[in-house]
Each structure stands twice: as structure tokens, then as C-alpha cells.
């Protein structure tokens, strides 16, 4: 079901449309939901999840994260400086979001369906926001070798880095979520 | 099968400090969101702080920021909640608990309970 | 900050009747909301989440329904192990904020 149109929801009559942060909330939900269907299958196929290796791939990894800083957290809440991080991190997310396309077999479609949710969710963040100045969009060239060097990895390293992405992308999109609420 | 124990409860003074623990066992505690949660004698539950998995992201009842902290080992399985300049009003069970969730479900929960551990602020 | 208000907060009834609690949130939690079952002496219980989603080992004589604003907790036949005291919560936004109680008990 695509986002918006909750299944419970389609009968019922005279339906307020959506505000724009119930569409975002929405969003973000509706992408929580195919990243879990995504791990569901990493973590079938591996035992990446219960793995305590995560540190040595994850140093070669540069996955987004909030910080106290941000003023995403309950503790030092700033609105503005949040929506800056929020889509700064998910503008950076992009990279590692077309790495996971061809790392799905069973669930390639649900890939597609969270890079293209994704880009529809930063579109609108983007509307929501008044700074834009702020806001740094990653430079191609570098994303280009980046993908390069990812894919370039042995199998065990892919398997860990795609669950490290799906793991960190979750985190981030919980936290984003649970600070587009306090807005 | 998943386990939650808490330790560390007892009797302070007003103003005193206890430092709660909660061991985990049964499931990978990294994966899962944690929650306190305190219930003073003869009265209904209150939601008292969450610690997120990785992010470090945490939060507090009003009621208690500033005062308390919550924090985790995922090494150790183990969740703490840190009880700073207690009050009379702090009395209560304090129950550790899971949040739904892991790797599938993103709506929020608890699923797993402790036993609970008594916290008693009296001179 | 968004207040929960549970009502009834005492609910006098007989074996077999359905029963119904209301959980009001002051504004929108779409449908972030969890019911819990906790009897005398004993830890509370996860009946339902996501305000309608029953969780796994809970018997189907309940149901959760709502979204938005006005929440409902169902027993359908009630039995004698369901007399207890029933709170709602709200994982929406922070400070997460239980509802007061409702205690089922018999007439």
C-alpha cells in the first residue's frame, strides 16, 4: 500500500487530507517498513545481525548519524538545525541506497521502493525547510567512487555493509522521525 | 526466552543517588529500543525514559530530566538509569522494559517486563 | 506535551459482557498507541500496539481500534482472568505518556 493510503484508511468517508507532516510521518513510516522487510532478508540469508564484527566494516564506511549536535535529540531540540541534519543525511544516504539495488534477491523490488521513497521524502523536507543555504549536497564525483570501491569488496564485506546500511538508515529515519514530531 | 532483570532499588534519603541496573538475556539487545518505567505505590504506570539502540538518542519524562539518566552497555547486555537528587515522589516500582521491535516492527510498545526493583526515597 | 485521558477510570461489570475503554489523546498520535493488561501483584502485559495490532499469545476476545485522536480497547465475553486494571500509551511523540488506568472489576 503506498504511503497515504493506509489500507484501514481507503473506506473511510470525507477524509481530511493529509497535512504536510502527517504525509512526511507517513513517508517515513511507509520506507521503516521496507527496510524491515530488506533486513528481514539479510538476516535470513546471514548472521550478519548477530554478528560482533560490525566494527571493522563499519570503519570503512561513512554512514550518516545523528548527534547531540544536530538538535535532533529530546535534549538540546533545535528545529531548524534538526531539518538541515535530517535531509543532509538522507541526501548522503542516497549513495549507499543505490549500493543496496543489486544486493536483493527475493526483495529487489522493495530495494527500488525505499530509493525511490527516499527521494520523494527529501522532496518533502526540502518544501518544509527555509534554510536550503544550509543544506550541502554530496559531490557526484566522490559518490561515484565510493560505489566503485563498496561493490568492490569481497562477499563477506558486501554482506556487512549491507546490513550495516539498512541498520544505520533505520536508526536514522527512527530518530528523524521521533524529532519531525516534536515539530 | 527473553529475560529483563533489574537490581539496585533500596532505600536513599532525599537528595540521595541510586544507579539502577537491568540485565538482558534471551535476544540481541543491541537490536532493541529500552525503556524505564516506575510505578508509585497504589498508582497507575508513568513512562520515565527511553534509550534508542545505536544513535545514543535518549528521553525523559519532565518529571524527572535533568535529575536521572539513562544509559547502556550493549557489550553487557545491561541497561542502567542513574538517579540523581531524589525526591519522596520518586517512590516506586521501576520496571526495565523492551521495546517491540528488533529488526521488524517500527511502532511502539513494550513487550518484555521485569519483575521490577523498589525504590523507597524516605528520611 | 500530548495528555492522555482514559475513561472510565472504574468499570463495574458481569462475565460475558463486553466491555469498551476509551483512550482521548489532546492531539494526534496517528496510531501510536498500545494498550497493557496488569493484574494485582503481577507485571503489566503488551495486549495491543500500533492501536489495533494484537500481540502474539493474546486472546482475540480483544481488540484495539482508532486512530488519530480517540482510541477504544474491546473485550468481547469478558472472563474472569481479564479482571484487571487496563492502561493505554502513547509512543507518539515525547514525554510518552500513559493513560491513568481503568480498573475492570465485577458489579
Known amino acids: 500500500v503506498p504511503p497515504g493510503e493506509d489500507s484501514k484508511d481507503v473506506a473511510a468517508p470525507h477524509r481530511q487530507p493529509l497535512t504536510s507532516s502527517e504525509r512526511i510521518d507517513k513517508q517515513i513510516r511507509y520506507i521503516l517498513d521496507g527496510i524491515s522487510a530488506l533486513r528481514k532478508e539479510t538476516c535470513n540469508k546471514s548472521n550478519m545481525c548477530e554478528s560482533s564484527k560490525e566494527a571493522l566494516a563499519e570503519n570503512n564506511l561513512n554512514l550518516p548519524k545523528m548527534a547531540e549536535k544536530d538538535g535532533c535529540f529530546q535534549s538540546g531540540f533545535n528545529e531548524e538545525t534538526c531539518l538541515v541534519k535530517i535531509i543532509t543525511g538522507l541526501l548522503e544516504f542516497e549513495v549507499y541506497l543505490e549500493y543496496l539495488q543489486n544486493r536483493f534477491e527475493s526483495s529487489e523490488e522493495q530495494a527500488r521502493a525505499v530509493q525511490m521513497s527516499t527521494k520523494v521524502l527529501i522532496q518533502f523536507l526540502q518544501k518544509k525547510a527555509k534554510n536550503l543555504d544550509a543544506i550541502t549536497t554530496p559531490d557526484p564525483t566522490t559518490n561515484a567512487s565510493l560505489l566503485t570501491k563498496l561493490q568492490a569488496q569481497n562477499q563477506w564485506l558486501q554482506d556487512m555493509t549491507t546490513h550495516l546500511i539498512l541498520r544505520s538508515f533505520k536508526e536514522f529515519l527512527q530518530s528523524s522521525l521521533r524529532a519531525l514530531r516534536q515539530m | 526466552q527473553v529475560q529483563l532483570v533489574e537490581s539496585g532499588g533500596g532505600l536513599v534519603q532525599p537528595g540521595g543517588s541510586l544507579r539502577l541496573s537491568c540485565a538482558a538475556s534471551?535476544?540481541?539487545?543491541?537490536?532493541?529500543?529500552m525503556t524505564w518505567v516506575r510505578q508509585a505505590p497504589g498508582k497507575g504506570l508513568e513512562w520515565v525514559s527511553s534509550?534508542?539502540?545505536?544513535?545514543?538518542?535518549?528521553a525523559y519524562a519532565d518529571s524527572v530530566k535533568g535529575r536521572f539518566t539513562i544509559s547502556r552497555d550493549n557489550a553487557k547486555n545491561t541497561l542502567y538509569l542513574q538517579m540523581n537528587s531524589l525526591k519522596s515522589e520518586d517512590t516506586a516500582v521501576y520496571y526495565c522494559t523492551r521495546n517491540l521491535g528488533g529488526v521488524v516492527v517500527t511502532t511502539n510498545g513494550y513487550d518484555y517486563w521485569g519483575q521490577g526493583t523498589q525504590v523507597t526515597v524516605s528520611s | 506535551d500530548i495528555q492522555m485521558t482514559q475513561s472510565p477510570s472504574s468499570l463495574p461489570t458481569s462475565l460475558g459482557d463486553s466491555v469498551t475503554i476509551t483512550c482521548q489523546a489532546s492531539q494526534s498520535i496517528s496510531d501510536e498507541l498500545s494498550w497493557y493488561q496488569q493484574k494485582p501483584g503481577q507485571t503489566p502485559k503488551l495486549l495491543i500496539y500500533g492501536a489495533s495490532r494484537l500481540q502474539t499469545g493474546v486472546p482475540s476476545r480483544f481488540s484495539g481500534r482508532g486512530s488519530g485522536t480517540s482510541f477504544t480497547l474491546t473485550i468481547s465475553g469478558l472472563e474472569a482472568e481479564d479482571l484487571a486494571t487496563y492502561y493505554c500509551l502513547q509512543g507518539y511523540s515525547w514525554p510518552f505518556m500513559f493513560g491513568q488506568g481503568t480498573k475492570v472489576e465485577l458489579k
Open positions: 534471551g535476544f540481541t539487545f543491541s537490536n532493541y529500543y
Open positions: 534509550i534508542y539502540s545505536f544513535s545514543g538518542d535518549t
